[in-house]
């Protein structure tokens, strides 16, 4: 069936080694277990993470993000799913795209990142 | 079971304070962008203010912006709303509402807390 | 901020009528909207969210359509828990601006 994949339509905040969330979900909801599920970057197309046959594929992934995020699946079962990157880094910044595949269907939604300084003050006057 | 339990309300003078919590249990607290939502007695529903799920971003509507702070305490499971400078306006029950990675909808509700401005 | 404007503001109705209310956006929120459902001294409902999908658990007789600046709710056979108060409201903005509530009433 079809579907369509939402993300959120504002750039998500995070401080410099941090962790960070990017959800995205299907619209209508329904059970996602046994679809693809992953972000790449654009504009190459680079694995950030993968999860397919109800696992995560860490061989696919970019070397940049191997050890350093999780899919949080809790709400899989109603098409809603989490990426948490941890220990962000600058080159994290800028865009990512989620997707679903469901056989050879397939639907995605574009999100962005900025990371920021911590320890950057800009000090007033 | 999902339950969101609201608390703090009661009656404040005009320019006072009140601290309300949103007690949460039942899912994954972190994983939920989280907003008060108010309704003035036999008035429509009235966004106030949201949260993202790890507290680093705050939005609030105009009525309230300078005045109301919300915040999050995830290790907690509760959302908090600070509001000072109240005004006979501000008189509403007060509900915390659940948004699944802030774009979704409100699918839970608390059941309100009634907050009186008045002298 | 994105205004939502709900007519009918009160609907007279019985049950197994057809019932329709409609929303509008003051500007395009493709199809950032759900519509809620309230009884006197109870928390809202979600019923419908993007505009057209049923959240789990709500009754089929409840439908959803429309995209940009014009929604509908449609309750197909009104049934005697439907009489409610329902507000649509907007989500494609931080500002989650609700509609003023239709109360849909006996006749």
């Known amino acids: 069936g079809q579907f369509r994949v939402i993300g959120p339509r504002h750039p998500i905040r995070a401080l410099v080694g941090d962790e960070v969330e990017l959800p995205c979900r299907i619209s209508p909801g329904k059970n996602a277990t046994g679809m693809e599920v992953g972000w790449y970057r654009p504009p190459f197309s680079r694995v950030v993470h993968l999860y397919r046959n109800g696992k995560d594929q860490d061989g696919d992934q970019a070397p940049e993000y191997r050890g350093r995020t999780e899919l949080l699946k809790d709400a899989i079962g109603e098409g809603k799913v989490t990426l948490r990157i941890r220990n962000v880094r600058f080159s994290d910044e800028g865009g990512f795209t989620c997707f679903f595949r469901d056989h050879s269907y397939q639907e995605e939604a574009a999100m962005e990142l900025k990371v920021e300084d911590p320890f950057y003050w800009v000090s007033p006057g | 079971e999902v339950q969101l339990l609201e608390s703090g309300g009661g009656l404040v003078q005009p320019g006072g304070s009140l601290r309300l919590s949103c007690a949460a249990s039942g899912f994954t607290f972190s994983s939920y962008a989280m907003s008060w939502v108010r309704q003035a007695p036999g008035k429509g529903l009235e966004w106030v203010s949201a949260i993202s799920g790890s507290g680093g971003s705050t939005y609030y509507a105009d009525s309230v912006k300078g005045r109301f702070t919300i915040s999050r305490d995830n290790s907690k499971n509760t959302l908090y709303l600070q509001m000072n400078s109240l005004r006979a306006e501000d008189t509403a029950v007060y509900y915390c509402?659940?948004?699944?990675?802030?774009?979704?909808?409100?699918?839970?509700w608390g059941q309100g807390t009634l907050v009186t401005v008045s002298s | 901020d994105i205004q939502m404007t709900q007519s009918p503001s009160t609907l007279s109705a019985s049950v197994g009528d057809r019932v329709t209310i409609t929303c509008r956006a003051s500007q395009s929120i493709s199809s950032w909207l759900a519509w809620y459902q309230q009884k006197p001294g109870k928390a809202p409902k979600l019923l419908i969210y993007?505009?057209?999908s049923l959240e789990s658990g709500v009754p089929s007789r409840f439908s959803g359509s429309g995209s940009g600046t014009e929604f509908t709710l449609t309750i197909s056979s009104l049934q005697p828990d439907d009489f409610a108060t329902y507000y649509c409201?907007?989500?494609?903005?931080?500002?989650?601006?609700f509609g003023q509530g239709t109360k849909v009433e006996i006749k």
């Open positions: 409201q907007q989500k494609d903005t931080w500002s989650y601006t």
């Open positions: 509402a659940r948004d699944w990675g802030g774009i979704y909808y409100f699918d839970y």
């Open positions: 993007d505009a057209s």
